[in-house]
């Protein structure tokens, strides 16, 4: 502890100018005081001035007022220092005494004489507050106050406690008139020397090294460091924990970079055409009556569906078509007839069946042939049978698609997995790309097909921390460290929820 | 207890960097009570803090060396270091690192014991 | 920049108190500590936040601080106390170490 016990003389009274022995000063007494202070004894005796003691130059002749001095020989108040826990009680004995000699030092004169004394005893708290009192005799008065306040940096009751304001990185904070630390704007802990981070700042994922920031820790992004940094190249996916890549719906593939619903989200197919999803950007357009391509975006001529009928030629026209009818038949399509079985109508073999009691008829074509009238040979492939560009083929009576590469079917209308063969050596996982299969591969091989055996295994000098396991093939650094619980990271290396400013989590 | 070890190579060329690590054992780097940092002594001199490092990666430099003076930490490794580049014969000294405690006021309690790195050509 | 500045030499008889002083520009007002350093050795904190003593350090080391002057006391100095002595304080965020002082124990 460390404190100081002052003393201000205010007013000495001696009118008579008389010595404790009944003697007069001649010409008049010049007075100077010596105080002790020691410990508090119920019967003031003789012996070391244990709290302290200090002597004053003469200060007035017989009767004076003191003025107040803060520096220099008489100083007033008097300064009595002390270095340890101030106990709350103390004696004082305040001596006036008559000098002959020096001004400034009378303590060192020959011939000093007693004036008068007083004994003070009892209890005293530490405070600004000064107790003020007066003290008579027969000859003499004085008047004086006095309290105990505590050095620079000490508090509390007793001056033990000590306290120094700072702000610098072992602390933020000023002192309270108890020696309790008081925290500057910003700062919190025992030693105020940990920031308050930007309120909402993730406690776990953030951190800050000054006030109100919010720095985040490897695997998390945002201002308050809430939000997960997917794998790299993660093209449509989200994560829930750093470096994951959880697919939007309609994506698939390691980064979500492979659509699987290419028509909802590209719109593909024109002229009202409808659109079916096979594979990874796979997709095949089915075109309304007159239009065709692997769109459907080629308008067909309007004549293109062969609209006339029983030999009828078509015209096209602005927006629609024309039928010019062979003699013998009428219509928009020439399908009325002003012929009969009569007149041998039906072509190619065909035979002629009456109709409407003969005011009609219908051809029965034999195999190959079409039309009202049986003469058209058949096109098998005029309906545009093969899907996914496949070739159509006329085979006498029958017609076959020739399928494009990865597609199958009597229509080509299924689509081949290239991982269908499984091309991926040693247990590699295979993953349909649209330019061809691609393998992940366990560890210790690598290569397009995992075919190729990797004599240094990324993970074979454990590289991953707190028993996590590791895998290669996944990633950019030749593996990925997947964490048990309770630790996060690249390489799982820091543990969750430790102290409020631990650096990491994942 | 806690004890400090710093490794690093005892002669760098002038003009180089010079680069040390503190290797810290029986004890988190992590812990929020700790700075730690490096000071050094030339030959028959006295102590000259260089500078500190929290395990958050805050850093506080000597002004006199700031411009070339950089100290990281890897909590992964419970490890700092110290890099000091352009060296010349007056950096020339051994190299400690300590441990600063909050608790103590920033007194420091734990020390490694030393390296001596010569700057010579 | 902030200085402190120290006695180059103290020499004191075994069991007398040796006192070393180290002054600094408003020192009063920061914490200083004190280091002993025996050659060959690194440096062991003997005081911190002025006249606190870490557990090991003996009693009769010492330490205050007020105005610009902090004092180490050794009282009943013995031999194996002769080593150099060094205060440090933190000026702001940066640290500072005197010259130190050789205490010399005749």
């Known amino acids: 502890g460390s404190g100081i016990f002052q003393l201000r003389l205010q007013e000495f009274v001696n009118q008579r100018g008389m010595l404790a022995n009944g003697q007069s000063c001649e010409p008049g007494c010049r007075t100077f005081f010596r105080i002790c202070l020691k410990h508090f004894q119920a019967t003031f005796s003789e012996g070391p001035c244990t709290f302290g003691n200090v002597s004053t130059p003469v200060l007035g002749t017989n009767s004076f007022v003191v003025r107040d001095k803060n520096s220099g020989s008489g100083r007033n108040p008097l300064q009595l220092p002390f270095n340890f826990t101030w106990p709350g009680t103390f004696s004082l004995n305040i001596q006036a005494w008559h000098t002959p000699g020096d001004d400034l030092r009378p303590e060192t004169s020959p011939g000093n004489s007693l004036i008068s004394q007083i004994i003070i005893q009892g209890s005293l708290a530490v405070g600004k507050i000064w107790r003020t009192d007066e003290q008579n005799d027969t000859l003499t008065r004085l008047s004086y106050s006095y309290r105990v306040i505590c050095s620079d940096n000490y508090y509390g009751e007793s001056c033990s406690r000590l306290c120094k304001k700072r702000d610098d990185h072992f602390g933020h904070y000023e002192c309270q008139p108890d020696g309790s630390l008081s925290c500057l704007p910003g700062w919190t802990g025992k030693y105020c020397d940990q920031p308050i981070c930007l309120s909402g700042c993730h406690e776990q994922n953030g951190y800050c090294s000054k006030p109100d920031e919010c720095i985040c820790r490897p695997g998390w992004q945002g201002r308050l460091c809430n939000e997960c940094i997917p794998h790299n190249g993660c093209r449509h996916g989200t994560c829930s924990i750093p470096w994951q890549c959880a697919c939007d719906e309609g994506w698939g593939g390691l980064f979500c970079d492979q659509d699987l619903n290419y028509c909802t989200h590209h719109s593909p197919c024109k002229n009202g055409s409808t659109c079916s999803n096979s594979g990874p950007k796979g997709y095949t357009c089915t075109c309304l009556p007159g239009y065709t391509g692997e769109h459907c975006e080629l308008g067909l001529s309007k004549c293109a569906s062969n609209p006339c009928r029983n030999g009828g030629s078509c015209k096209d026209q602005e927006n629609s078509y024309h039928c010019l009818c062979p003699p013998g038949y009428y219509g928009q399509h020439c399908e009325h007839s002003t012929l009969t079985c009569a007149d041998s109508p039906c072509f190619n073999g065909g035979s002629c069946r009456e109709r409407n009691q003969g005011s009609s008829y219908a051809c029965e074509c034999p195999p190959n042939f079409t039309g009202s009238n049986c003469e058209k040979k058949v096109d098998r492939c005029t309906s545009n049978p093969c899907a996914n560009g496949g070739q159509c083929q006329n085979r006498g009576p029958s017609r076959t698609c020739r399928c494009r590469p990865g597609f199958t079917g009597t229509h080509c209308e299924l689509h081949i997995s290239d991982c269908a063969r499984s091309p991926c050596a040693h247990g590699g996982t295979c993953h349909d790309l649209e330019n061809g299969p691609v393998c992940t591969c366990p560890a210790g091989f690598s290569g397009r097909r995992c075919e190729v055996r990797i004599t240094h295994d990324a993970c074979a000098s454990g590289p991953c921390f707190n028993g996590a396991t590791c895998y290669t093939g996944l990633s950019p650094n030749n593996f990925v460290c997947n964490c048990p619980y309770g630790f996060v990271g690249s390489r799982c290396e820091f543990p969750v929820g430790l102290p409020p400013s631990f650096p990491w989590v994942a | 207890e806690v004890q400090l070890q710093e490794s690093g190579p005892g002669l760098v060329k002038p003009s180089e960097t010079l680069s040390l690590t503190c290797t810290v054992s029986g004890g988190s780097i992590s812990s929020s009570s700790y700075y730690w940092g490096w000071i050094r002594q030339p030959p028959g001199k006295g102590l000259e803090w260089i500078g500190d490092?929290?395990?958050?990666?805050?850093?506080y430099y000597n002004p006199s060396l700031k411009s070339r003076v950089t100290i990281s930490v890897d909590t992964s490794k419970n490890q700092f270091s110290l890099k000091l580049s352009s060296v010349t014969a007056a950096d020339t000294a051994v190299y400690y690192c300590?441990?600063?405690?909050?608790?103590?006021?920033?007194?420091?309690?734990?020390w490694g014991q030393g390296t001596l790195v010569t700057v010579s050509s | 920049s902030y200085e402190l500045t120290q006695p180059p030499s103290v020499s004191v008889s075994p069991g007398q108190t040796a006192s070393i002083t180290c002054s600094g520009q408003r020192l009063g007002d920061k914490y200083a500590s004190w280091y002993q350093q025996k050659p060959g050795q690194s440096p062991v904190l003997v005081i911190y936040?002025?006249?606190k003593r870490p557990s090991g350090i003996p009693e009769r080391f010492s330490g205050s601080n007020s105005g610009d002057t902090a004092t180490l006391t050794i009282s009943g100095t013995q031999p194996m106390d002769e080593a150099d002595y060094y205060c440090q304080a933190w000026d702001r965020d940066t640290g500072v170490f005197g010259y130190g002082t050789k205490v010399t124990v005749l």
């Open positions: 490092i929290y395990y958050t990666g805050s850093t």
């Open positions: 936040e002025d006249s």
């Open positions: 300590a441990r600063f405690d909050v608790s103590l006021g920033g007194g420091s309690d734990t």
